[in-house]
């Protein structure tokens, strides 16, 4: 019987000859467990594994710790791939993280981190980032050094407040910090002066809620 080829990430999918954007089945490192992810095979050379997407407010991002762990939503639309998979993947080899943002005026920007990984669940999926470049601000809108992940039922932030409950969504909150790409989705003309929206402070300021966001990762040696 023919051995089935498994892919750890979209870079491996790309290198196998699948160069069309779409949903692909990936396999957890050192496991047979599978997960569906959207692969961007066109942007910046392709091979990007999409780990988060916001675009229309169709999915509720005020989810539990377990939901953020395993992922939720639809890979073809708004979704969160899952902290456990991303943690395992990014601890296997070095990955870059690209965050692509769109505002309501037709502008686009990005932040690129040359090294990204998440700690294990035991360490609350703490985010680690190095080497910021890009057009979405010279200062990282994800607080440095990285913080633990927090959800509405898992308060690991550095605030005596409860960031995830106040600002909605799971995120690497500080107190609560200059970003939250998993905040409330606000439509056009309702997207300003919103403290709990989709925020990337060092591009659009504190009260501006973005139109669309994509977080994507790829091996650094791709």
């Amino acid at each position: 019987k023919e051995e089935q080829i498994s892919f750890r990430d979209c870079a491996e999918v790309f290198k196998s000859g699948h160069t069309t954007n779409g949903i692909y089945t990936l396999t957890f490192p050192n496991s047979t467990e599978e997960i569906k992810a959207y692969c961007d095979m066109e942007a910046g050379g392709g091979g990007w594994t999409i780990i988060q997407r916001r675009e229309d407010g169709s999915v509720d991002f005020q989810r539990t710790w377990k939901e953020y762990k395993v992922g939720f939503g639809n890979p073809s639309g708004e979704y969160w791939l899952g902290n456990e998979f991303v943690s395992q993947l990014t601890n296997q080899q070095r990955y870059v993280l690209k965050i692509h943002l769109k505002d309501w005026e037709g502008n686009e920007a990005y932040s690129l981190y040359e090294h990204f990984y998440l700690s294990s669940e035991e360490l609350n999926y703490r985010i680690h980032l190095k080497g910021l470049t890009g057009t979405a601000g010279k200062i990282s809108s994800i607080s440095q050094p990285g913080n633990d992940f927090s959800t509405k039922d898992g308060d690991n932030d550095k605030c005596i407040c409860k960031c995830s409950q106040m600002l909605t969504g799971g995120w690497w909150f500080d107190a609560c910090g200059p970003s939250n790409l998993n905040g409330m989705y606000y439509p056009q003309r309702q997207n300003t002066n919103k403290f709990n929206g989709i925020k990337w402070y060092y591009w659009k300021g504190s009260g501006y809620s973005l139109k669309a966001t994509t977080m994507m990762i790829r091996p650094a040696d791709f």
């Epitope: 607080s143 550095k158 005596i160 600002l167 107190a175 609560c176 200059p178 504190s206 009260g207």
Partner: antibody, heavy 129, light 109 residues
């Protein structure tokens, strides 16, 4: 660990100015308001105002308007409080203290009234002729 | 401006329960924070948002707030609890922080 370290004791003449510093470490300086609170000998706590290190916005207590100036230098994570036209009744211990800015807003309209969870050790300012 | 009223002193025997009050007009509609200050030291936050405790503060410290009175309760009082205690609220009408006058807690020996 998280701490606020203040400058040393000062002795000033009436009419002079004093500038007290407060160096933050162990946390994101711009993510918290910095407050100044004073305590005259044997008296209670008196709030003087806050600065938002993120953008430099300030809110001073009415009593100190025109005499107090709060500034910050984000490159060294340090806040400053300058009090001018000193009088003998300004003799007090001056504390800096932080409170969270969860909205990451500069507008006072989005001020979050969080508690002062970390305090500096205090700076004694004596005003005497 | 908003005024907070605290009793100047409260005395209690070790092992007993101390209750320190903080009065203010409709204070129940505001979030109250409590600080402990020992002689020669900076204040320390012991209760915030009426009844929450920061990490490291013993469960013996609790708070409540309703109507015109907020209360800090210290159960099983120890000698080390002897200190001044201050309540604090944010007065949104003046955009100012207000402290109570402070209460000296004496633990009887």
């Amino acid at each position: 660990q998280v701490q606020l370290v203040q400058s040393g004791a000062e002795v000033k003449k009436p009419g002079a100015s004093v500038k007290v510093s407060c160096k933050a470490s162990g946390y994101t300086f711009t993510g918290y308001y910095m407050h100044w609170v004073r305590q005259a000998p044997g008296q209670g706590l008196e709030w003087m105002g806050w600065i938002n290190p993120n953008c430099g916005g300030t809110n001073y207590a009415q009593k100190f308007q025109g005499r107090v100036t709060m500034t910050r230098d984000t490159s060294i994570s340090t806040a400053y409080m300058e009090l001018s036209r000193l009088r003998s009744d300004d003799t007090a211990v001056y504390y800096c203290a932080r409170s969270p800015n969860p909205y990451y807003y500069c507008s006072s309209g989005y001020y979050y009234p969080g508690a002062f969870d970390i305090w500096g050790q205090g700076t004694m300012v004596t005003v005497s002729s | 401006s908003y005024v907070l009223t605290q009793p100047p002193s409260v005395s209690v025997a070790p092992g007993q329960t101390a209750r320190i009050t903080c009065g203010g007009n409709n204070i129940g509609s505001k979030s109250v924070h409590w600080y402990q200050q020992k002689p020669g030291q900076a204040p320390v936050l012991v209760v915030y948002d009426d009844s929450d405790r920061p990490s490291g503060i013993p469960e013996r410290f609790s708070g409540s707030n309703s109507g015109n009175t907020a209360t800090l309760t210290i159960s099983r009082v120890e000698a080390g609890d002897e200190a001044d205690y201050y309540c604090q609220v944010w007065d949104s009408s003046s955009d100012h922080w207000v402290f109570g006058g402070g209460t000296k807690l004496t633990v009887l020996s």
